[in-house]
């Protein structure tokens, strides 16, 4: 059974069949006699009740408000009301891209590794009984596939497979032909096997500090998604209330790996924070890598060669 239309803000492309299904549907069947009403408001118009007479494009069935099809002027707020239950949606109907078989904003993308198995399947369970054929297009060129009910691609990926795949379902309603499009963007990349994680920068860092001031030690690494980065310091981590581990930040690289950074913040630096090791470690199934920071009083810096300093 399909779920209800639970998202309160919805964007849809003009010219396609569309429906809103309220989320108290099971309840509605129990109270068949209860008055159920659909309303629309947009701009100056406040709560206009919808019924099949409002527009030849609108159909009402039990829990569903259908549009055959949805048009730009359907943009607005919609309300379903039944006893003390109300559900509201904000519908934004956007222009169809007249120069393409799909509208860019409605695309979902995934990365597939070369030589790995991937698939595209065309399904639409809500309109399933009304669909009389479905076509699959690649970059808006129709693919000749055996099954015209649920066309499918199942294969090991090659670089030539990269592109936009559009499933177009054709259906009849009241003697008119409609179509619904869903587009997938497939990007083919080189094999993305796990890398050996690496911490960025020198292995030993002397940091010049002043007593009573604060310092932020930044530890950055290139790692796999499941790898972890953490700080180790002192006898027992967490025993110094002036030392705080900040939240880890991660950014995905174009190759599907991660650039992670974790900051250790030391506030109100005291003597006990000087000349001790603050270790940052990245750990993976393939091993670990560690880099160390040592806080040195600014006055003592003359004794240390310049090339070992970090800011």
């Amino acid at each position: 059974a399909e779920s209800c239309t639970s998202r309160p803000h919805i964007t849809v492309v003009e010219g396609e069949p569309f429906y809103l299904k309220h989320c108290s549907c099971s309840l509605a069947h129990e109270i068949e006699t209860t008055t159920k009403s659909w309303y629309k408001s947009s701009g100056s118009q406040e709560h206009v009740e919808l019924n099949p007479r409002s527009s030849s494009r609108i159909a009402l069935h039990d829990c569903v408000l259908e549009f055959w099809p949805v048009e730009l002027n359907d943009t607005g707020s919609y309300f379903f009301q039944m006893k003390n239950y109300t559900q509201k949606w904000k519908l934004n109907v956007i222009r169809r891209n007249k120069h393409s078989c799909f509208t860019e904003r409605q695309v979902t993308s995934k990365i597939v590794e070369v030589k790995k198995f991937f698939q595209i399947t065309c399904e639409n369970s809500y309109y399933q009984t009304l669909v009389n054929s479905t076509s699959l297009y690649k970059n808006c060129k129709k693919l000749l596939l055996e099954n015209n009910k649920n066309p499918t691609i199942k294969k090991n990926a090659e670089f030539e497979d990269q592109g936009y795949y559009s499933c177009v379902h054709f259906l009849h309603h009241n003697g008119k032909l409609f179509n619904i499009t869903k587009t997938f963007n497939i990007t083919i990349v080189e094999d993305r096997s796990n890398i050996v994680p690496v911490l960025l920068g020198p292995k030993l860092n002397h940091v010049a500090v002043e007593l009573g001031k604060n310092v932020r030690l930044n530890c950055s690494a290139l790692l796999n998604e499941e790898d972890v980065i953490y700080w180790m310091f002192g006898e027992e981590n967490g025993s110094d209330p002036n030392i705080h581990e900040e939240k880890e930040m991660r950014i995905m690289t174009p190759e599907g790996k991660w650039h992670a950074s974790k900051v250790l913040r030391i506030e109100n630096i005291g003597e006990s924070n000087l000349n001790v090791l603050y270790n940052c470690t990245v750990a993976s199934t393939g091993g670990t890598d560690t880099k160390s920071f040592i806080l040195v009083r600014k006055a003592d810096m003359a004794d240390i060669p310049g090339h070992v300093f970090t800011r």
Partner: nanobody
Framework: QVQLQESGGGSVQAGETLRLSCTAS????????MGWYRQAPGNKCELVST????????YYADSVKGRFTISQDNTKNTVYLQMNSLKPEDTGVYYC?????????????WGQGTQVTVSS
């Protein structure tokens, strides 16, 4: 446009656990509900679990209730599927999907997915 990236699959023994991750980029995370589908060899595509990025409400297929937990980390734009007490019948390719309506009626098993193999 939203870009989805699944990971975390693997081979385990029955009773063990796995955690799948799906990271969304290129769009505002809360524009979509996020979910997981799966497909076992020779079987149809099945909706396993979904989560609303607005209020955190969740759905689970009867076959995974009490064993699987879906969660989200909005700061990382990531949804996780924690799979505990895995059974051989959980074997299949798991696909992440984003739905901008919450109706979960338009496909689901597409792309490369992440393979989960559970042996007895």
């Amino acid at each position: 446009q939203v870009q989805l990236q699944e990971s975390g699959g693997g081979s385990v023994q029955a009773g063990e656990t796995l955690r799948l991750s799906c990271t969304a980029s290129g769009s505002t995370f809360d524009e979509y509900d996020m979910g997981w589908y799966r497909q076992a060899p020779g079987n149809k595509c099945e909706l396993v679990s979904t989560i609303s990025t607005i209020d955190g409400s969740t759905y689970y297929a009867d076959s995974v209730k009490g064993r699987f937990t879906i969660s989200q980390d909005n700061t990382k734009n990531t949804v996780y599927l924690q799979m505990n007490s895995l059974k051989p019948e959980d074997t299949g390719v798991y696909y992440c999907e984003a739905d901008d309506r919450g109706t979960w009626d338009r496909g689901g098993c597409w792309g490369q997915g992440t393979q989960v193999t559970v042996s007895s």
